[in-house]
C-alpha cells in the first residue's frame, strides 16, 4: 500500500533507510584524515553501529576518532598523529542503521592505506646497443592502489619525443623499434606521477649508448609486447578495453588491427599511440572474440591474437523495492541480478543472513524473491539482498512495513454529480485504511445499489452507473469499513437531458469557387449552457476577422469561395458542460482538372516521318474522372499565341504518338478535361520543327470568273500555312479553253489569284491549281470549269399574262428567255412593281417600288400584299453576273375589297338611356363606301341580344342610340361597307351606368385676375352632361364673409368665369349639385393696377 497525501492525522513510523555512505573503495594517503560516512533516515530515530572485517567496531572508543553527533548520522573521522597511522585502520567496514522497525545495512567499504611512494634503490647499468637494433628501457614504478601517470623525460625536463619508432607502453616501459645514433643520451628518466598523493618520483637516469654502424641490416617485425603469439583477456561490460601491440624491426613497422570474428565497432573504437593501442569504449557482450594486431614492414610481418572474454560485475534486472503493507497482504521482494559469471545472491533480514535466523520464520525464498504471506505488523523488517561475483558486489536494502490504519474516505462529502441521460456517471469514494477497507454503495433506502446491473463498482471505490435514466437522480451513500472503524459519505446525482443533434450537416459535392452551407440543429437540457461549434478535419473553425472565408451563425456554417483545399470532413459539435455530440459530413470539391504538371517529347527521330511521341504526367482530377486529354500545338513563327488541337486521347492515357505536318514549328501543350470542363494547360513543351516536304494538298474552291467582259479571274482558297510543308508556298495555275484538248497555259504565282486577259465574252475554260514549294509539287490537281467575263443580257422576257387572284394578289407569268441572248449565266429575273394610285383618284405622291428576285428556273411569281381597287405598273428583266437586261412592261388594276376600320369611335352620354356615337371614316376605303353597320350587345349577357343597324349613308359621322338600360355596359362595333361587304370593325365598350353616376370634375383648377376668376375642368370621356352651382365666398373680417349669388353651370362647357370680384381678396369656391356639396377650392384675386380683361376664349354664363 501507499499512504495517500490526503490521509492526514496519522503519524506513521518509518523504517531506516541509508541515505549516504562512503564509496566502496577508499584509499587514504599518509597525510589524509580518514572519513567514513554513513547517514540514514527513519522514525523513531536511528541508532548506528559499525563492523570492521566482520567484527564489531566502536568508533567512539578509538583514539583520534571524531563521531558526528547528529540524529541521522553515524559518520566518523579519524585524524592521524603520524604518517603511518592509516595502516592500523585498513580493512572492510560496514555500517548498520537500526530503529524499532528494523535494520538497514551499508555496502562494504574497503579502506586502503597508501604509503609514500618510493622507487626501490637500484644501480642502473648503461644500455649498450648497436644502431638499428631494438631496445626496451624499463620503468617498473612502485605499486599503487590508484592509477598513476608515467612520463619519460631527460634531465632538462623535456619530454622524450614519441612516434612510430619510439613508444611508451601501458606498463611505462619505453620501446625503441630500432635505435638511431641520435637516440644516444645518458639521461632517459622515467617519472611516476601519483595523483592521490600529488607527488612525482623519478627513476635513476638510464644511459643509452648507441654504437654507429656502416651497414644497418633490415629485419622483419618482432613483437616486443606482448611477446607471445596470443593472450587471453577479460574485459568488463561497460568498461573500456585497451589492447596494445609494440613491435621492433627495421624499417620501423606499422601496426594494423583486425577483428576476424566480426566487424570492428567503428563508433566506439579509437587508435592511439601511432596505432599501437586500440581502445574500445563501453565494452558490450557483442565485443567478445578475437582481436588481432599485425606489425608489418617491407621484410615481413608479426602478429598477436588477443582472445577477449567479456564478463560483467553484478547488475540489477529487478531491484527490490520498499513498500507499506496492510495486515493480511502478501509481501514479495524481487531481487533479480545478472552478471558474468552469474552472481551468487544472499538475503539478510535486518542485517542478519537468513541462514543464521531461526528456522520457524514465515518467509520463503523462491526464484530470487523473498515472499511473506498474510503479513502482520510484527512482520515489519528491513531486508538486504546482496549479489556478488569476482568482479564486484551489489547490495539493496528494502523494507516490509506492515501498518494498521483506520478506514477514512478521502472523497469530499455531499458532492453533486451531473451527467446526461444515456451516459455513464462516476460517483467517487476514495477510501484508505490498513487493512484496505471494504466499500459499498447504498441508495436512500439503505439498500445496496448493485441489484441493478447498470450499477457497477470499481476497485478504487468509484461507483459507475451506465445508461443513466432521469429517475436515477437522487442521493447515494458510500460506506467504507475495516477492522478498526467505518465511515460514510453522501453523493448527489442529477441526471440531465442528453444533447442531441436533431438535424446534422449533410455530405455534399460542390463546385470550386461556389459556396456551401452546412446546417445543424440540436436540442439541449434547458438548465445547461449550450454551444454549437464547427470543426473542419478535426480543427476548430472560427470566423477570421480579416477574411470572409467562413461565416458561422445560428447553427449555420457557410464556406465561401470553395477551393480544393477546403475538401474534407466538417462536423457540427453540439456541447454542454456535461456532454458533447458530433455530426459529420463530407465535403467534396469538384471542378475542372488541375494542370498537367509535366510534358516530355520523345522519339524525336520520328520527326523525319512527321511524327513525335508526347508523354505527360496525369493531372489532378479534382474528384471528377478525367475524360480526355486535349493535345494542342502552337507555331510561334506562323501564328504565335494561337493554339490548334491535334486531337484528344482518353483520360486514362498519358502518352500518344502524334501525326504532324512537315515544316511546322511545333510547341505542344496538354490540357485535361473532365465533366466540369478543361483545366489549366500544361507547361509548354520544347519547340520542334519537322523537316520540309512537298505539299500534300492543293488549294480548294478554285473558280474562274471574269470581272470584265474580256478577262477571267482565277481564284482559290490559299493553303493554310500548316499545309505549306516548307517556309513558302506558290501556286502553279494551268488553264485552256474547254473541249480544245490543246496545250495548257500555266503560270506560277504567290498570290491566291490570277487574271487571264484578252478572253472572248463568256467562254468556258478548264482550270487546274497546284501547290508548289522548294521540295516539289502537290498531288495532281482536279480540273474545274471557269468562264470568261459576262456582258449585259440582251434577252427581253415575254409576258404571258396576269391572273387576278383576289383584291390584293395577282399571278404574273412569262416565257423563258433565249440563253444565247443572256451573254452569261442566267442568274434569274428581277420583277419590279409599283402602285400608280387608287381607281378613285390618282395620287401625285412619291412612288414606292417593290422588287422580287425570281430564280432562273422559274417563270412566274405571285405578287401579294397589293392594295385593292388600285392601278399597278409591272416590269420583268433577265439578269446575269454582269447585270440586268431590258425590261418588258405591263399595267394592271386590283378589284374592290372590303374597307379598313372606321377611325376614332367616341361615346357621348346624352341621358340615363341615350348615347351619341361619333366616328371618322376609314383611312383605306378599298373601293366605294356604301355605308356602315353598327352592332351592339350588353356585356354581361355573353353576346346574346345582339342588335344591328345598316346605316346606308356613307357620309354619316354620328348616330344617336336610345332606349339603353342605365344599369348595363355595352359592346359597340362599327364597320364600314363597300359592295364587297363590311370591313374591319372598331370596338368600344361603355354605357350610361358608369357615366351618369357621381359627377367627376376631373382635373379642376382656378386662376384669377384682378376682378375675375376662371374655373376650368376636363370633362371625362362619355360623362353624361349635368348642371351644377358655383358659389364664390369672400374671406376675411372686413369682407364679412360676403357671398356672390350662386351661378348655374353646364358640365360640358369645361370652364366658368366669375366677374365682379374684389381685387386682392381670398375667395373660397364651392361646387354644388342637386344641393349636395361636391367640391371646394380657394383662389386669390390680384391687386389693382392691372388691365381688367379675362383670358381670351373663355365662355361665361
Amino acid at each position: 500500500i501507499q499512504i495517500p497525501e490526503e490521509y492526514e492525522g496519522h503519524h506513521v513510523m518509518e523504517p531506516p533507510v541509508i541515505t549516504e555512505q562512503s564509496p566502496r573503495r577508499l584509499v587514504v594517503f599518509p597525510t589524509d584524515d580518514i572519513s567514513l560516512k554513513c547517514e540514514a533516515s527513519g522514525k523513531p530515530e536511528v541508532q548506528f553501529r559499525w563492523t570492521r572485517d566482520g567484527v564489531h567496531f566502536k568508533p567512539k572508543e578509538e583514539l583520534g576518532v571524531t563521531v558526528y553527533q547528529s540524529p541521522h548520522s553515524g559518520s566518523f573521522t579519524i585524524t592521524g598523529n603520524n604518517s603511518n597511522f592509516a595502516q592500523r585502520f585498513q580493512g572492510i567496514y560496514r555500517c548498520f542503521a537500526s530503529n524499532k522497525l528494523g535494520t538497514a545495512m551499508s555496502h562494504e567499504i574497503r579502506l586502503m592505506a597508501e604509503g609514500a611512494p618510493k622507487w626501490p634503490k637500484e644501480t642502473v647499468k648503461p644500455v649498450e646497443v648497436e644502431e638499428g637494433e631494438s631496445v626496451v628501457l624499463p620503468c617498473n614504478p612502485p605499486p599503487s592502489a590508484e592509477p598513476l601517470r608515467i612520463y619519460w623525460m631527460n634531465s632538462k625536463i623535456l619530454h622524450i619525443k614519441q612516434d612510430e619508432r619510439v613508444t611508451m607502453g601501458q606498463n611505462g616501459n619505453l620501446y625503441f623499434a630500432n635505435v638511431l645514433t641520435s637516440d644516444n643520451h645518458s639521461d632517459y628518466i622515467c617519472h611516476a606521477h601519483f595523483p592521490g598523493t600529488r607527488t612525482i618520483i623519478q627513476k635513476e637516469p638510464i644511459d643509452l649508448r648507441v654504437k654507429a654502424t656502416n651497414s644497418m641490416i633490415d629485419r622483419k617485425p618482432r613483437l616486443l609486447f606482448p611477446t607471445n603469439s596470443s593472450s587471453h583477456l577479460v574485459a568488463l561490460q561497460g568498461q573500456p578495453l585497451v589492447l596494445e601491440c609494440i613491435a621492433e624491426g627495421f624499417p620501423t613497422p606499422t601496426i594494423k588491427w583486425l577483428r576476424p570474428s566480426g566487424p570492428m565497432p567503428a563508433d566506439r573504437v579509437t587508435y592511439q599511440n601511432h596505432n599501437k593501442t586500440l581502445q574500445l569504449l563501453k565494452v558490450g557482450e557483442e565485443d567478445d572474440g578475437e582481436y588481432r594486431c599485425l606489425a608489418e614492414n617491407s621484410l615481413g610481418s608479426a602478429r598477436h591474437a588477443y582472445y577477449v572474454t567479456v564478463e560483467a560485475a553484478p547488475y540489477w534486472l529487478h531491484k527490490p523495492q520498499s513498500h507499506l503493507y496492510g495486515p493480511g497482504e502478501t509481501a514479495r521482494l524481487d531481487c533479480q541480478v545478472q552478471g558474468r559469471p552469474q552472481p551468487e545472491v544472499t538475503w539478510r533480514i535486518n542485517g542478519i543472513p537468513v541462514e543464521e535466523l531461526a528456522k520457524d520464520q514465515k518467509y520463503r525464498i523462491q526464484r530470487g524473491a523473498l515472499i511473506l504471506s498474510n503479513v502482520q505488523p510484527s512482520d515489519t523488517m528491513v531486508t538486504q539482498c546482496e549479489a556478488r561475483n569476482r568482479h564486484g558486489l551489489l547490495l539493496a536494502n528494502a523494507y516490509i512495513y506492515v501498518v494498521q490504519l483506520p478506514a477514512k474516505i478521502l472523497t469530499a462529502d455531499n458532492q453533486t454529480y451531473m451527467a446526461v441521460q444515456g451516459s455513464t456517471a462516476y460517483l467517487l469514494c476514495k477510501a484508505f485504511g490498513a487493512p484496505v477497507p471494504s466499500v459499498q454503495w447504498l441508495d436512500e433506502d439503505g439498500t445496496t445499489v448493485l441489484q441493478d446491473e447498470r450499477f457497477f463498482p470499481y476497485a478504487n471505490g468509484t461507483l459507475g452507473i451506465r445508461d443513466l435514466q432521469a429517475n436515477d437522480t437522487g442521493r447515494y451513500f458510500c460506506l467504507a469499513a475495516n477492522d478498526q472503524n467505518n465511515v460514510t459519505i453522501m453523493a448527489n446525482l442529477k441526471v440531465k437531458d442528453a444533447t442531441q443533434i436533431t438535424q446534422g450537416p449533410r455530405s455534399t459535392i460542390e463546385k470550386k469557387g461556389s459556396r456551401v452551407t452546412f446546417t445543424c440543429q440540436a436540442s439541449f437540457d434547458p438548465s445547461l449552457q449550450p454551444s454549437i461549434t464547427w470543426r473542419g478535419d478535426g480543427r476548430d473553425l472560427q470566423e477570421l476577422g480579416d477574411s470572409d472565408k467562413y461565416f458561422i451563425e445560428d447553427g449555420r456554417l457557410v464556406i465561401h469561395s470553395l477551393d480544393y483545399s477546403d475538401q474534407g470532413n466538417y462536423s457540427c459539435v453540439a456541447s454542454t458542460e456535461l456532454d458533447v455530440v458530433e455530426s459529420r459530413a463530407q465535403l467534396l470539391v469538384v471542378g475542372s482538372p488541375g494542370p498537367v504538371p509535366r510534358l516530355v517529347l520523345s522519339d524525336l527521330h520520328l520527326l523525319t516521318q512527321s511524327q513525335v511521341r508526347v508523354s505527360w504526367s496525369p493531372a489532378e482530377d479534382h474528384n471528377a474522372p478525367i475524360e480526355k486529354y486535349d493535345i494542342e500545338f502552337e507555331d510561334k513563327e506562323m501564328a504565335p499565341e494561337k493554339w490548334y488541337s491535334l486531337g484528344k486521347v482518353p483520360g486514362n492515357q498519358t502518352s500518344t504518338t502524334l501525326k504532324l505536318s512537315p515544316y511546322v514549328h511545333y510547341t505542344f501543350r496538354v490540357t485535361a478535361i473532365n465533366k466540369y470542363g478543361p483545366g489549366e494547360p500544361s507547361p509548354v513543351s520544347e519547340t520542334v520543327v519537322t523537316p520540309e516536304a512537298a505539299p500534300e494538298k492543293n488549294p480548294v474552291d478554285v473558280k474562274g470568273e471574269g470581272n470584265e467582259t474580256t478577262n477571267m479571274v482565277i481564284t482559290w482558297k490559299p493553303l493554310r500555312w500548316m499545309d505549306w510543308n516548307a517556309p513558302q508556298v506558290q501556286y502553279r495555275v494551268q488553264w485552256r479553253p474547254q473541249g480544245t484538248r490543246g496545250p495548257w497555259q500555266e503560270q506560277i504565282v504567290s498570290d491566291p489569284f490570277l487574271v487571264v486577259s484578252n478572253t472572248s465574252t463568256f467562254v468556258p475554260y478548264e482550270i487546274k491549281v497546284q501547290a508548289v514549294n522548294s521540295q516539289g509539287k502537290g498531288p495532281e490537281p482536279q480540273v474545274t470549269i471557269g468562264y470568261s467575263g459576262e456582258d449585259y443580257p440582251q434577252a427581253i422576257p415575254e409576258l404571258e399574262g396576269i391572273e387576278i387572284l383576289n383584291s390584293s394578289a395577282v399571278l404574273v407569268k412569262w416565257r423563258p428567255v433565249d440563253l444565247a441572248q443572256v451573254k452569261g449565266h442566267l442568274r434569274g429575273y428581277n420583277v419590279t412593281y409599283w402602285r400608280e394610285g387608287s381607281q378613285r383618284k390618282h395620287s401625285k405622291r412619291h412612288i414606292h417600288k417593290d422588287h422580287v428576285v425570281v430564280p432562273a428556273n422559274t417563270t412566274s411569281v405571285i405578287l401579294s400584299g397589293l392594295r385593292p381597287y388600285s392601278s399597278y405598273h409591272l416590269e420583268v428583266q433577265a439578269f446575269n453576273g454582269r447585270g440586268s437586261g431590258p425590261a418588258s412592261e405591263f399595267t394592271f388594276s386590283t378589284p374592290e375589297g372590303v374597307p379598313g376600320h372606321p377611325e376614332a369611335l367616341h361615346l357621348e352620354c346624352q341621358s340615363n338611356t341615350s348615347l351619341l356615337l361619333r366616328w371618322q371614316p376609314p383611312l383605306s376605303h378599298n373601293g366605294v363606301l356604301t355605308g356602315y353597320v353598327l352592332s351592339y350587345h350588353p356585356l354581361d349577357e355573353g353576346g346574346k341580344g345582339q342588335l344591328s343597324f345598316n346605316l346606308r349613308d356613307p357620309e354619316l359621322r354620328t348616330h344617336n342610340l336610345t332606349d339603353l338600360s342605365p344599369h348595363l355596359r355595352y359592346r359597340f362595333q362599327l364597320q364600314a361597307t363597300t359592295k364587297e361587304g363590311p370591313g374591319e370593325a372598331i370596338v368600344r365598350e361603355g354605357g350610361t351606368m358608369a357615366l351618369s353616376g357621381i359627377s367627376d370634375f376631373g382635373n379642376i383648377s382656378a386662376t384669377a385676375g384682378e376682378n375675375y376668376s376662371v374655373v376650368s375642368w376636363v370633362p371625362k370621356e362619355g360623362q353624361c352632361n349635368f348642371r351644377f352651382h358655383i358659389l364664390f365666398k369672400a374671406l376675411g373680417e372686413e369682407k364679412g364673409g360676403a357671398s356672390l349669388s350662386p351661378q348655374y353651370v353646364s358640365y360640358n362647357q369645361s370652364s366658368y368665369t366669375q366677374w365682379d370680384l374684389q381685387p386682392d381678396t381670398d375667395y373660397e369656391i364651392h361646387l354644388f349639385k342637386e344641393r349636395m356639396f361636391r367640391h371646394q377650392m380657394a383662389v386669390k384675386t390680384n391687386g389693382t393696377g392691372r388691365v381688367r380683361l379675362p383670358p381670351a376664349g373663355f365662355a361665361t354664363e
Epitope: 516530355v600 522519339d603 524525336l604 527521330h605 520520328l606 507547361p683 520544347e686 519547340t687
Partner: antibody, heavy 119, light 107 residues
Framework: QVQLVQSGAEVKKPGSSVKVSCKAS????????IQWVRQAPGQGLEWIGY????????DYAQKFQGRVTLTADESTSTAYMELSSLRSEDTAVYYC????????????WGQGTTVTVSS | DIQMTQSPSSLSASVGDRVTITCRAS??????VAWYQQKPGKVPKLLIY???TLHSGVPSRFSGSGSGTDFTLTISSLQPEDVATYYC?????????FGGGTKVEIK
C-alpha cells in the same frame, strides 16, 4: 550578335553549393530554352538539364535530380544553375548553351565556368 | 538512357587525308544525331544535325551519314584547322547523351 557570358571560376568544399550564372544578349531571351552541359577534366560532355525562360519550367537528367536547380531572370536575361551537396566528382567545366529553335541542339555556347570541388 | 559509343577515341592523320569517325547508339534513334567539334580550349560548335544536314557556315568537306544505330562523320580532306575533339549527340530522347569523343590530330 548572340552571346552567352558565364560567371567566373569557383573553388568549393565538398557538401557545399555553387551557383553559376549565364547572361544572354543579342536575341529575345524568352524565345529560346537554355540548356546546361558539363565536361569533367579530360572527359566528354554530359547533359544536365534545361529551362524555359518564359515559363521557368525546367527538367533535369535523373543523375542530377534533387541536387540541381535551374532558374532564370527575365528582367536581366540571365539563367542560373545551382548544384548542391558538391562532391569531388562534380569538378568540371559547366557550360550554358542556347537550344536551337526547333531541335534539342546547342547552337550557341557560353565560355564555360570551371568549378573545382576539393577539401 | 541511350548510350552513344564513339570510335576510335583518338586518331592521327595527315593533311589531305580522308578521316572517318563512327558513333553507335544503344537503341534506334532514327537520324536524330548531331556532331560537334571542340577545338582545344574552346567551346563545342555544331557541325551536323539530322545525321547528314550541314549546319550553316560549316565547310563542305564535313559530311555525315547513317540511321538507326550506326552513324559516321567524314572529313573528306583533313585540314590543320580540323584538329579538335569530335562528339556525336543523340536527340531522339531525353536525357540528351553524347559520345565519349574522338580526338583528331595531324601526323
Amino acid at each position: 550578335q548572340v552571346q552567352l557570358v558565364q560567371s567566373g571560376a569557383e573553388v568549393k568544399k565538398p557538401g557545399s553549393s555553387v551557383k553559376v550564372s549565364c547572361k544572354a544578349s543579342g536575341y529575345t531571351f524568352t524565345n529560346y530554352w537554355i540548356q546546361w552541359v558539363r565536361q569533367a577534366p579530360g572527359q566528354g560532355l554530359e547533359w544536365i538539364g534545361y529551362i524555359n525562360p518564359s515559363t521557368y519550367y525546367s527538367d533535369y537528367a535523373q543523375k542530377f535530380q534533387g541536387r540541381v536547380t535551374l532558374t532564370a531572370d527575365e528582367s536581366t536575361s540571365t539563367a542560373y544553375m545551382e548544384l548542391s551537396s558538391l562532391r569531388s566528382e562534380d569538378t568540371a567545366v559547366y557550360y550554358c548553351a542556347r537550344r536551337q529553335f526547333g531541335l534539342p541542339l546547342f547552337d550557341y555556347w557560353g565560355q564555360g565556368t570551371t568549378v573545382t570541388v576539393s577539401s | 538512357d541511350i548510350q552513344m559509343t564513339q570510335s576510335p577515341s583518338s586518331l592521327s592523320a595527315s593533311v589531305g587525308d580522308r578521316v572517318t569517325i563512327t558513333c553507335r547508339a544503344s537503341q534506334d534513334v532514327g537520324t536524330a544525331v548531331a556532331w560537334y567539334q571542340q577545338k582545344p580550349g574552346k567551346v563545342p560548335k555544331l557541325l551536323i544535325y539530322w545525321a547528314s544536314t550541314l549546319h550553316s557556315g560549316v565547310p563542305s568537306r564535313f559530311s555525315g551519314s547513317g540511321s538507326g544505330t550506326d552513324f559516321t562523320l567524314t572529313i573528306s580532306s583533313l585540314q590543320p584547322e580540323d584538329v579538335a575533339t569530335y562528339y556525336c549527340q543523340q536527340y531522339s530522347n531525353y536525357p540528351l547523351t553524347f559520345g565519349g569523343g574522338t580526338k583528331v590530330e595531324i601526323k
